[in-house]
């Protein structure tokens, strides 16, 4: 079982990032830690998408990783996609420090995110509370600014 993974986020614009994942035990939480730069100040949706396919840019990654066929939600919600990691917050310098602990994603098993795509979005994720159909699918987080395939790390 992999205990560490890494993702290098890149896009067409200035947004780039490095996100590290660590899971000490197979059923334990995953630490998600790193940084993303080139963002506008404020909240940006942050999700694991289903496919590790970036052939046509971030759009090839498909929808949020959702093996349980649930509605979109926030990371603390029972009703959420596995890939729903909520928002990252960029400061006035355009840098978002990421420090998340999530107990739904995994680096092994049915919820394994390795080989899938991590995406940072243009807008805030409304965590499924936006009151429209798109909210229950994407959180109205808008376009995909940068993405990268999550790979096993040393």
């Amino acid at each position: 079982m992999a205990t560490k993974a890494v993702c290098v986020l890149k896009g067409d614009g200035p947004v780039q990032g490095i996100i590290n994942f660590e899971q000490k035990e197979s059923n334990g939480p995953v630490k998600v830690w790193g940084s993303i730069k080139g963002l506008t100040e404020g909240l940006h949706g942050f999700h694991v998408h289903e496919f590790g396919d970036n052939t046509a840019g971030c759009t090839s990654a498909g929808p949020h990783f959702n093996p349980l066929s649930r509605k979109h939600g926030g990371p603390k919600d029972e009703e959420r996609h596995v890939g729903d990691l909520g928002n990252v917050t960029a400061d006035k310098d355009g840098v978002a420090d990421v420090s998340i602990e999530d107990s739904v994603i995994s680096l092994s098993g049915d919820h394994c995110i390795i080989g899938r795509t991590l995406v940072v979005h243009e807008k805030a994720d409304d965590l499924g509370k936006g009151g429209n159909e798109e909210s229950t699918k994407t959180g109205n987080a808008g376009s995909r600014l940068a993405c990268g395939v999550i790979g096993i790390a040393q």
Epitope: K4, E22, K31, G34, S35, G94, V95, D97
Partner: antibody
Framework: QVQLVQSGAEVKKPGSSVKVSCKAS????????IGWVRQAPGQGLEWMGR????????NYAQKFQGRVTITADKSTSTVYMELNSLRSEDTAVYYC????????????WGQGTLVTVSS | EIVLTQSPDFQSVTPKEKVTITCRAS??????LHWYQQKPDQSPKLLIK???QSFSGVPSRFSGSGSGTDFTLTINSLEAEDAAAYYC?????????FGQGTRLEIK
């Protein structure tokens, strides 16, 4: 207030190793990235590598790859930089410096540790 | 590796003068460029972060500008205590690199 306190000056023989420590206080140690930068006498600043203590991940400059090891002891909020196979050109002041995360500047620096390599 | 080239290497200036130091990156680094001051026998101190933002406690006579590949550190109305070496630093990509430094001497 963040403080980085380094170990004292060292005199080493060529071919030997040196291990310099850097103890952090005044902040959440796990959310730092600690880098090591050296400065030879009368010269500029040279980045050697960094460690992310929360993940035990270290990155090294290619020039030092295989010769330097950076480790962290989270229980004491201390980072160590070990440099092997010392040569006279390694005579320098070695600084540890803190940054909040990737892409950010080094906002706090240790006082420096002079390492002299001489036979 | 991103190479940072500072200009000039050395400058001798009189108090109250305006000083400009430039830093050119070998490829675009956006605004991930920072400036440090280092006085003799002291550790470097952060002056300017992200090309143009003053770090806390830094006197207002220090300012920075630029983005992409060309950056400038300006010291308005130089004071005697500003005699030091000044370094630019990029945090855009690994390996992290520094400029070769600019030494300011006060006449």
């Amino acid at each position: 207030q963040v403080q980085l306190v380094q170990s004292g000056a060292e005199v080493k023989k060529p071919g030997s190793s040196v291990k310099v420590s850097c103890k952090a206080s005044g902040g959440t140690f796990n959310n730092f990235v600690i880098g090591w930068v050296r400065q030879a006498p009368g010269q500029g600043l040279e980045w050697m590598g960094r460690i992310i203590p929360i993940l035990d991940i270290a990155n090294y400059a290619q020039k030092f790859q295989g010769r330097v090891t950076i480790t962290a002891d989270k229980s004491t909020s201390t980072v160590y930089m070990e440099l092997n196979s010392l040569r006279s050109e390694d005579t320098a002041v070695y600084y540890c410096a803190r940054t909040g995360n990737y892409y950010k500047p080094y906002d706090y620096w240790g006082q420096g540790t002079l390492v002299t390599v001489s036979s | 590796e991103i190479v940072l080239t500072q200009s000039p290497d050395f400058q001798s200036v009189t108090p109250k003068e305006k000083v400009t130091i430039t830093c050119r990156a070998s490829q675009s680094i956006g605004s991930s460029l920072h400036w440090y001051q280092q006085k003799p026998d002291q550790s470097p101190k952060l002056l300017i972060k992200y090309a143009s933002q003053s770090f806390s406690g830094v006197p207002s006579r220090f300012s920075g500008s630029g983005s992409g590949t060309d950056f400038t550190l300006t010291i308005n109305s130089l004071e005697a205590e500003d005699a030091a070496a000044y370094y630019c630093h990029q945090s855009s990509s690994l390996p992290i690199t520094f400029g070769q430094g600019t030494r300011l001497e006060i006449k």
